[in-house]
């Protein structure tokens, strides 16, 4: 088949990292500099992709291969194939059109990107807070007060859960 | 909004010589091949040469008689054109792509075209 395919079309002996330069009888030319082609046969070669300014090479463009691109620290990739590189902010904080903010009262955000999400109600499941959540902690749930033996039914019931950084009033 | 501007057409006699200009504006020519097309009243396109990372490939029509180049810092682009024939007479194009060579792709952008007329 692939003899029969080669008869037919020359350009099907062009290997990866060359083109079949139909000006010049169909001849496999190597791609220039900076551009590459990943498969063979290929009429064109595709131009090598340039990570500048807030991106950077992860991976060097080859004749066979793109080049691959991640973001600058202070920033994370976004999008197929680290399309956009978005600013980082601090765990308990979320990106907005205006920055950084932190995040309201109820909610968190444990890593340096994404959007603040709401503590997890432990009574939805039966359950009790053991630790109170933060800016950058969720709430721990804990048993149920049910679960509990009777010998710990004296437990101080854990305050209710509160900004962090506020002194308990 | 990508603009790309041809000047440098004109009247020239055979035998003669001019050089087109091609200049970018709202992006660099860096991440793109840069190519030029012509088309002559009633016929079909023709593929005249692309230019990318030092390299230039063109047409079968033009017997060395093209030459593009590029001049990075005023992010511009040049076709000169020597021993220019009548049969060079057509509306030149300058147009750029992610694929080099462009003979068989159609451009990302183009511009408006410059004319060019061979006569005595």
């Known amino acids: 088949f692939e003899r029969t395919r080669s008869l037919q079309d020359p350009c099907s002996n062009c290997p990866a990292g060359t083109f079949c330069d139909n000006n010049r009888n169909q001849i496999c030319s190597p791609c220039p500099p900076n551009s590459f082609s990943s498969a063979g046969g290929q009429r064109t070669c595709d131009i090598c992709r340039q990570c500048k300014g807030v991106f950077r090479t992860r991976k060097e463009c080859s004749s066979t291969s793109n080049a691959e691109c991640d973001c600058t620290p202070g920033f994370h990739c976004l999008g197929a194939g680290c399309s956009m590189c978005e600013q980082d902010c601090k765990q308990g904080q979320e990106l907005t059109k205006k920055g950084c903010k932190d995040c309201c009262f109820g909610t968190f955000n444990d890593q340096k990107r994404g959007i603040c999400r709401p503590w997890t109600n432990c009574s939805l499941d039966g359950k009790s807070v053991l630790v109170n959540g933060t800016k950058e902690r969720d709430v721990v749930c804990g048993p149920s007060p049910a679960d509990l033996s009777p010998g710990a039914s004296s437990v101080t019931p854990p305050a209710p859960a509160r900004e962090p950084g506020h002194s308990p009033q | 909004e990508v603009q790309l501007v041809e000047s440098g057409g004109g009247l020239v006699q055979p035998g003669g010589s001019l050089r087109l200009s091609c200049a970018a504006s709202?992006?660099?020519?860096?991440?793109?091949?840069v190519g030029w097309f012509r088309q002559a009243p009633g016929k079909e396109r023709e593929y005249v040469g692309t230019?990318?990372?030092?390299?230039?490939h063109y047409g079968d029509f033009e017997n060395n008689r093209f030459t593009i180049s590029r001049d990075n810092s005023k992010n511009t682009v040049y076709l000169q054109m020597n021993n220019l024939r009548p049969e060079d007479t057509a509306v030149y194009y300058c147009?750029?792509?992610?694929?080099?060579?462009?003979?068989?792709?159609?451009?990302?952008?183009q511009g408006q075209g410059t004319q060019v007329t061979v006569s005595s």
């Open positions: 147009a750029i792509s992610l694929k080099y060579p462009m003979a068989t792709v159609t451009p990302d952008y």
């Open positions: 709202g992006r660099t020519f860096d991440n793109y091949a």
């Open positions: 230019y990318w990372s030092g390299y230039a």
